[in-house]
């Protein structure tokens, strides 16, 4: 039975040209995390595998940095980066957990972090 929950940074905003950390955390389970995928809509950004390390999608290599931890840092943000991001946790023995983050990239200098929220 899957008992875990994914806690994410929720709805966040950042300035154009800046950077942002996408962060998820799996709690309430003793399952072992074997891999975390980061996706933007249906596009793979990066994978962190417990044995193999990080794979950064070649098209994002210049502006995606691994970490901190299992998170992902997006750099040189553009308004086109606005949208949904997903952290997909592969775990043993539970299976797959998915968290969602919505990022809005703002032209102005007014960019505030949203509250955390949980996806069961």
């Amino acid at each position: 039975m899957m008992t875990g929950t994914i806690e994410t940074t929720g709805n966040i905003s950042a300035e154009k040209g800046g950077s942002i950390i996408l962060q998820c955390h799996l709690s309430s389970t003793t399952a072992q995390v074997t891999q975390v995928n980061w996706e933007q809509q249906d596009q793979l950004l990066a994978i962190c595998n417990a044995d193999l390390g990080w794979h950064i999608s070649p098209s994002f290599k210049d502006r995606v940095a691994p970490g901190p931890g299992l998170g992902l840092t997006l750099q040189s943000l553009t308004v086109n980066d606005t949208g949904e991001y997903f952290c997909i946790y592969h775990t043993y023995p539970d299976g797959t957990y998915t968290g969602r983050i919505f990022l809005e990239v703002l032209e102005s200098s007014v960019a505030e972090h949203g509250a955390r929220f949980q996806i069961p």
Epitope: L52, H55, S59, K61
Partner: antibody, heavy 119, light 107 residues
Framework: QVQLVQSGAEVKKPGASVKVSCKAS????????MYWVRQAPGQGLEWIAF????????TYNQRFRGKATLTVDTSISTAYMELSRLRSDDTAVYYC????????????WGQGTLVTVSS | DIQMTQSPSSLSASVGDRVTITCRAS??????LSWYQQKPGKAPKLLIY???SLPSGVPSRFSGSGSGTDFTLTISSLQPEDFATYYC?????????FGQGTKVEIK
């Protein structure tokens, strides 16, 4: 088009070392990891290691730690694999291969380099 | 280590036949499986990645399916150039491992 051209066949004595090169063209070299795989005569495929030219980091199959050393020269888009303390059972065709866009698979392969270890 | 077991190890078929090769992983690898074709004296060539995705340039008669531990490569209508050895490979952990190969021969 994407191309990987490997260095020529080598004949080495047991205990010697050999360095195989893999020259890449047709893509941004630093964006894709480079993998090395070997195939002994009449046998299947065995993954050795890969290197990320973007940061120089390598990941090895535990079996080949201390046997294989991977390096890159990004200025000439070339990857290298050095094999040390060669034994007769290291006789194989060694392939370089560019990693995939979506994970740890092998998208484009070099033509292979036959390394023969014989006294 | 994750073991990859292919079956059959060889098969004989005729041009136009539908051919199915299976690959079983010793533990779940989700959909992180690729297939390669190798002809004698040549380097392998990627046919399928992530269990079912075809790289550009690979004919549509090749298809892949499966997830978890059981996977299938299907050639819908075998062509003369398809006689070769086929390998599966997981890309889910270290070490990356290949199946032992399936040789497709002319009947």
């Amino acid at each position: 088009q994407v191309q990987l051209v490997q260095s020529g066949a080598e004949v080495k004595k047991p205990g010697a070392s050999v360095k195989v090169s893999c020259k890449a063209s047709g893509y941004a070299f630093s964006r894709y990891s480079m993998y090395w795989v070997r195939q002994a005569p009449g046998q299947g495929l065995e993954w050795i290691a890969f290197i990320d030219p973007y940061n120089g980091g390598s990941t090895y199959n535990q079996r080949f730690r201390g046997k294989a050393t991977l390096t890159v020269d990004t200025s000439i888009s070339t990857a290298y694999m050095e094999l040390s303390r060669l034994r007769s059972d290291d006789t194989a065709v060694y392939y370089c291969a560019r990693g995939g866009d979506y994970g740890w698979y092998l998208g484009v392969w070099g033509q292979g380099t036959l390394v023969t270890v014989s006294s | 280590d994750i073991q990859m077991t292919q079956s059959p190890s060889s098969l004989s078929a005729s041009v136009g036949d539908r051919v199915t090769i299976t690959c079983r992983a010793s533990q779940s690898i989700y959909s992180y499986l690729s297939w390669y074709q190798q002809k004698p004296g040549k380097a392998p060539k990627l046919l399928i990645y992530n269990a079912k995705s075809l790289p550009s340039g690979v004919p549509s008669r090749f298809s892949g399916s499966g997830s978890g531990t059981d996977f299938t490569l299907t050639i819908s209508s075998l062509q003369p150039e398809d006689f070769a050895t086929y390998y599966c490979q997981h890309h889910y952990g270290n070490p990356l491992t290949f199946g032992q190969g399936t040789k497709v021969e002319i009947k």
